[in-house]
Interface confidence: medium
């Protein structure tokens, strides 16, 4: 009778993560009597995957009954495959021996490759906000995919970006891979509503790429423009001065009025109006009782936006042209929601 051969007909098997891998193995003879074992890898460091005689292998099932004496099909199924299961699997026939069974013959091996989907791309922007005309970096990361081939693209509002660098790690063979990409984006004043998108395409995604997004609203800071104007006289001795704070983002803003360098009033932007581009406008006004002043008044609108150094705009109010009303000591009056006198 011909000597037993162990046949592993599949040189390689490709399985998607989470699915079941079938590793085929048949023997050409029933002799010698002895059990079969499956290993991953060869040599002294090989890992036991299945032993029909002993051990607990909850993920492994046999295709046929390996303990049946005339069975020559030693194929196994491994359930819930993960990238960590990738490797070369050997079906090894043992000969019954005393006290231990003796390795008799091995199959040629079957390489198990695992197709694993990349994780959802995570896009991160810079830690600090930046202003228009500045270049900021965005990173995109995705992990756990296999095989290594992967395509990554960057978009800003649907327009593909070209200024980026991408690395897939590790460089050598691995059970799974990670991708890391950094894109450079130049901010504009209109970017409050803009999005940066990282798109990852992989064989496991069947033409339906994964996307990660970052809203530039979390990255951009649009500093305000200030305009201080003197409104027509409301009453004989009163002048209404307004400070228009335009096109700023984010909303966090504090405004201080100064009269000749002295703080008159401080308020926080609350009831703002939103522009189509996502930036905000706000207006504050000051009622100045000119009769309280003998000399010209320098009114300054000072704005601290989003924790940045204050910017200011001044307006010189000429008081000589206005007759002074005796007995009044009110220099300015807030006509906003919280009316109060500043002395």
């Amino acid at each position: 009778e011909e000597e037993l051969q162990v046949i592993q007909p599949d040189k390689s098997v490709l399985v998607a993560a989470g699915e079941t891998a079938t590793l085929r193995c048949t023997a050409t003879s029933l002799i010698p009597v002895g059990p079969i074992q499956w290993f991953r890898g060869a040599g002294p460091g090989r890992e036991l995957i299945y032993n029909q005689k002993e051990g607990h292998f909850p993920r492994v099932t046999t295709v046929s009954d390996l303990t049946k004496r005339n069975n020559m099909d030693f194929s196994i199924r491994i359930g819930n495959i993960t990238p960590a299961d990738a490797g070369t699997y050997y079906c090894v026939k043992f000969r019954k021996g005393s006290p231990d069974d003796v390795e008799f013959k091995s199959g040629a091996g079957t390489e198990l490759s695992v197709r694993a989907k990349p994780s959802a791309p995570v896009v991160s922007g810079p830690a600090a906000r930046a202003t228009p005309q500045h270049t900021v970096s965005f990173t995109c990361e995705s992990h756990g995919f296999s095989p290594r081939d992967i395509t990554l693209k960057w978009f800003k509002n649907g327009n593909e970006l070209s200024d980026f660098q991408t690395n897939v790690d590790p460089v050598g063979e691995s059970v799974s891979y990670s991708i890391h990409s950094t894109a450079k984006v130049v901010l504009t004043r209109e970017d409050v509503h803009s999005q940066v998108i990282c798109e990852v395409a992989h064989v496991t995604l069947q033409g339906d790429p994964l996307r990660g997004t970052a809203n530039l609203s979390e990255t951009i800071r649009v500093p305000p423009t200030l305009e201080v104007t003197q409104q027509p006289v409301r009453a004989e001795n009163q002048v209404n001065v307004t400070c228009q704070v335009r096109k700023f983002y984010p909303q966090r803003l504090q405004l201080t009025w100064l009269e000749n360098g002295n703080v008159s009033r401080t308020e926080t932007a609350s009831t703002v109006t939103e522009n189509k581009d996502g930036t905000y406008n706000w207006m504050s006004w000051l009622l100045v009782n000119v009769s309280a002043h003998r000399d010209d008044v320098k009114l300054t609108c000072q704005v601290e936006h989003d924790g940045q150094p204050a910017v200011s705009k001044s307006h010189d109010l000429k008081v000589s042209a206005h007759p002074k009303e005796q007995g009044s000591n009110t220099a300015a009056e807030n006509t906003g929601s919280n009316e109060r006198n500043i002395y």
Partner: antibody, heavy 122, light 107 residues
Framework: EVQLVESGGGLVKPGGSLRLSCAAS????????MHWVRQAPGKGLEWVSS????????YYADSVKGRFTISRDNAKNSLYLQMNSLRAEDTAVYYC???????????????WGQGTTVTVSS | DIQMTQSPSSLSASVGDRVTITCQAS??????LNWYQQKPGKAPKLLIY???NLETGVPSRFSGSGSGTDFTFTISSLQPEDIATYYC?????????FGGGTKVEIK
Amino acid sequence: EVQLVESGGGLVKPGGSLRLSCAASGFTFSSYSMHWVRQAPGKGLEWVSSISSSPSHIYYADSVKGRFTISRDNAKNSLYLQMNSLRAEDTAVYYCAKEPRSYWHGYGMDVWGQGTTVTVSS
Amino acid sequence: DIQMTQSPSSLSASVGDRVTITCQASQDISNYLNWYQQKPGKAPKLLIYDASNLETGVPSRFSGSGSGTDFTFTISSLQPEDIATYYCQQLSNYPITFGGGTKVEIK
């Protein structure tokens, strides 16, 4: 000494149920496939069911499939046969038997119990 | 299912006689055939496994031969304690099947 002792037989009405047990001793029970074989009064031997050592592989005769369930508890060194929907033709002496070789089956039955009698009658 | 046809169903022989029982399988079963002895009121006992191998402790007057579909069981010199029914059994495939048995009596 290798020994198998069956129990659980008795008189039962048609349609009724019985659970047979087989207590094993004198060998490493978990390493051996086990069988149930029956013999109707004055008749020959009829194989009923087998269970491998794992026990991932189970086999039944067509005459009992869907009605009988073989199981084992390796921790208790015990083999069981749950018999439901019993019929008059299930009346027999039921033997449990072990395979001669550990981890393998298909070599036969080298040790038998003394048998337990099941009578199905109204 | 594999059918096992055993003959004769019964025989009577004298002490010291050579007794032969045959068993025919309905399909090739290689050498996956065992022979059992069952004495009245007792459990069966394995005598021969794999068609021709004598089980440990079984007297050498018992022997078996054959392969494929045709098998023979022989008692070279019948003894009084050999009074029993003998069964062949195939183990090539499930369901396991037994022959109908041969009842051996002393003349």
